[in-house]
């Protein structure tokens, strides 16, 4: 019995087609992805093949103005239109709190939303009961398939799930649910979830009875053969894991941002054993036309976005200096504003011993592309922020050793004076450079704000200590020559859309007046 699994993950509100790098579409003839194009391909496969499931492995939320404005209603609407069969909860589904998940998505979705390792307690338990499920048995042709969901247990550090949701260990939580499916005579089981490729592989290895793993969170690109675009495969598609009980379990993921549609064909025998598995992600490029009815619907929803981008978010009473003459040479107040917003967006009081789980921010000065003049009645709009942060990136959470941070700050000024983008703006860090010294030895003082303290204060950086840092995804991926970050990071979780982080902060503060205050000397 052959099953076709179509899958997406980490779409991050790319409802419209995007350019090849998943930023805003500029030249339509070269654009990719988007729900209208996705629908065309899904329908084509549904017509051609008998047993098809369309699955999403989480993080539909967060990433463009679509989410900022529609807050998840757009996800429910368009996923319903595409007739998704199931979705797993990702960490970003909690970005607007539990209410921001329940009202727009859980109550509106016409497909099951899954996670076996999230347990509700207290008053939330009855409110959320039945709105998401640990598993769902889906009829597919003459057969039935069990789908079990899972979500990163790091979600409380990455998003805002509140205090009434407990995130359990994925493997511990999944096993009893899979066992339950087996007792219901369901012998074809897909684990669909959002914990990253390493955990996907562990689930394939450790959870008895799971036949296929469809994952997300780590934006992993897998491909067999010559890849069709710029993404470099982390392995073959599907990636085969040998389980502890001796079965070959295919593990798949489909990069991110709706650029690809994962396409996996599985042949099962009567016992539910995977006899064969093969496929590849399908690049959703312009050779696939956008479905006209979905496209028309997108255009209708688009109108509200255009109105939103010119509305006032808040005010500044000072000039926000985002000029390259400042931000690539010295501390600039636009850099301070953005870093403060980045830390504020990551406030998570999850442990009494810590005032927060992260206190540090670094930001490449070259990523700040425009100032904002306060003399326009102080008004700040989304449009203004899009000029400052035009690349559509995210502000991510990483874990780095102190020694890696020291290398990063040395790199920040290794060719100082040439107006290059690697000069770092900071938050929660005091750095002193001596530019008379030779490159690689210019950082003379590096103090960082404590987290395990009730009164935050600055302490010298310890080389062997592991620190959490918020930074742009561009830096996490080694951009601007920060190869040491990419090579040495111990953990990387993608965060919220850069503009959204700053806009939320400005809206919260109402009036801002960031200063140059001696963070960089």
């Amino acid at each position: 019995w052959e099953l076709t699994i179509l899958h997406t993950n980490d779409v991050h509100s790319r409802l419209e087609q995007t350019s090849e790098d998943s930023s805003k579409c500029v030249n339509a003839s070269r654009c990719m992805g988007g729900v209208a194009r996705l629908f065309t391909k899904v329908q084509q496969i549904r017509r051609a093949e008998p047993n098809v499931l369309l699955l999403d492995a989480g993080d539909q939320y967060q990433g463009t103005i679509w989410f900022t404005v529609y807050k998840g209603a757009e996800v429910a609407h368009f996923m319903n239109a595409l007739r998704y069969d199931a979705m797993a909860l990702g960490n970003h589904e909690f970005d607007n709190g539990v209410e921001g998940l329940i009202e727009p998505l859980l109550k509106e979705a016409k497909f099951p939303i899954l996670s076996a390792n999230i347990k509700a307690k207290g008053p939330l338990a009855s409110q959320i009961s039945g709105l998401y499920l640990p598993y769902k048995v889906l009829p597919v042709g003459d057969e039935v398939v069990g789908i079990v969901g899972y979500t990163s247990k790091e979600t409380p550090f990455l998003s805002n799930p509140g205090t009434n949701l407990v995130f359990e260990d994925e493997i511990t939580a999944l096993q009893p649910e899979v066992d339950k499916l087996k007792t219901l005579n369901v012998n074809k089981i897909i684990a669909l979830g959002h914990s990253g490729f390493e955990m996907d592989k562990l689930i394939a290895q450790k959870v008895r009875g799971v036949d296929v793993v469809v994952g997300g969170h780590s934006n992993t690109f897998l491909y067999t053969g010559n890849p069709p675009s710029k993404e470099v495969p982390a392995g073959k598609y599907p990636f085969i894991v040998t389980s502890d009980d001796g079965r070959k379990v295919p593990v798949v993921q489909a990069y991110a941002f709706g650029k690809y549609l994962g396409y996996l064909k599985i042949e099962f025998d009567e016992r539910g054993n995977v006899i064969s598995s093969h496929g590849n992600p399908i690049l959703l490029n312009s050779s696939i036309p956008e479905d006209p009815s979905i496209k028309a619907d997108i255009n209708k929803w688009r109108i509200k976005l255009d109105n939103y981008s010119t509305q006032e978010l808040g005010k500044t009473i000072v000039y926000l200096d985002g000029s390259s003459q400042s931000c690539r040479f010295r501390e600039c107040n636009m850099g301070n504003l953005i870093c403060d917003a980045m830390i504020n967006n990551n406030l998570r009081h999850t442990d009494e011993m810590f005032w927060n789980h992260v206190s540090m921010c670094i930001l490449n000065g070259g990523g700040i592309r425009s100032p904002i003049d306060e003399r326009n009645n102080g008004t700040i709009t989304w449009e203004n922020l899009a000029a400052v942060l035009p690349f559509g990136g995210t502000f991510d959470l990483v874990q780095l050793k102190g020694s890696t941070l020291k290398k990063a700050f040395e790199h920040s000024v290794h060719r100082y004076g040439q107006s290059t983008g690697e000069f770092l703006q900071v938050g929660g860090i005091h750095v002193v450079y001596d530019l008379s010294r030779k490159p690689g030895d210019r950082v003379v003082k590096l103090d960082v704000l404590c987290t395990k303290c009730r009164v935050p204060s600055y302490d010298p950086l310890k080389m062997d200590e592991v620190y959490k840092v918020i930074l742009p995804n561009f830096l996490a991926n080694g951009g601007d020559g920060f190869q040491m970050i990419k090579d040495e990071l111990l953990r990387h979780d993608s965060g919220d859309q850069d503009i959204n982080v700053v806009s939320t902060y400005i809206s919260k503060m109402k009036v801002i007046y960031p200063a140059v205050e001696g963070r960089i000397k």
Partner: antibody
Framework: EVQLVQSGAEVKKPGASVKVSCKAS????????MNWVMQAPGQGLEWMGR????????FYSQKFKGRVTMTVDKSTSTVYMELSSLRSEDTAVYYC???????WGQGTTVTVSS | DIQMTQSPSSLSASVGDRVTITCRAS??????LNWLQQKPGGALKRLIY???SLDSGVPSRFSGSGSGSDYTLTISSLQPEDFATYYC?????????FGGGTKVEIK
């Protein structure tokens, strides 16, 4: 649990036909196919062909083409294998086996003798 | 048709021995290979499917490996109940074909 139960032993004369049945249970019958395998006395296994339960599509091994007919009765989840123009070298045990031979019938002994 | 050459055709071994049986296909069969066990009474049982996946209930002393046209069944420590005849089966293309069998006997 998958179970395949075959019909009983048969003794046939050369030139006659034999029809062996295989009744399946414990799985969604229409979603799969059935193989038939022959084993002559003291010999190895030989694949004869297979039938798709849902629509009766068949694929026969060239060696048996023209003499073998596989049919299906979806209402009783039973598959049949008929072998015609029997000769002495058709004396063997005939097995039905699920799609990828994960489960086997107990075998049906067919003796061709004058 | 794809020919499956299985070797050895028979072997004598003692309890606790490591036993290896090989199957060579006349062309690439890309993982589409099963290993079957037939006890003297005639009952057939699949041990390994898709080259290396172990059927449920089959002891972990049985393992399968290989790719392309060369495949191996290994019994890491032979037990009394393992004395039987073993067959490989390719299902990469029609007609499916079996190896000639390997009879594992007590030394």
């Amino acid at each position: 649990e998958v179970q395949l139960v075959q019909s009983g032993a048969e003794v046939k004369k050369p030139g006659a036909s034999v029809k062996v049945s295989c009744k399946a249970s414990g799985y969604t019958f229409t979603a799969y196919f059935m193989n038939w395998v022959m084993q002559a006395p003291g010999q190895g296994l030989e694949w004869m062909g297979r039938i798709y339960h849902n629509n009766g599509d068949t694929f026969y091994s060239q060696k048996f083409k023209g003499r073998v007919t596989m049919t299906v009765d979806k209402s009783t989840s039973t598959v049949y294998m008929e072998l015609s123009s029997l000769r002495s070298e058709d004396t063997a045990v005939y097995y039905c086996a699920t799609s990828y031979v994960g489960d086997w019938g107990q075998g049906t002994t067919v003796t061709v003798s004058s | 048709d794809i020919q499956m050459t299985q070797s050895p055709s028979s072997l004598s071994a003692s309890v606790g021995d490591r036993v290896t049986i090989t199957c060579r296909a006349s062309q690439d069969i890309g993982d589409s290979l099963n290993w079957l066990q037939q006890k003297p009474g005639g009952a057939l049982k699949r041990l390994i499917y898709a080259t290396s996946s172990l059927d449920s209930g089959v002891p972990s002393r049985f393992s399968g490996s290989g790719s392309g046209s060369d495949y191996t069944l290994t019994i890491s420590s032979l037990q009394p109940e393992d004395f039987a005849t073993y067959y490989c089966l390719q299902y990469a293309s029609f007609p499916w074909t079996f190896g000639g069998g390997t009879k594992v006997e007590i030394k």
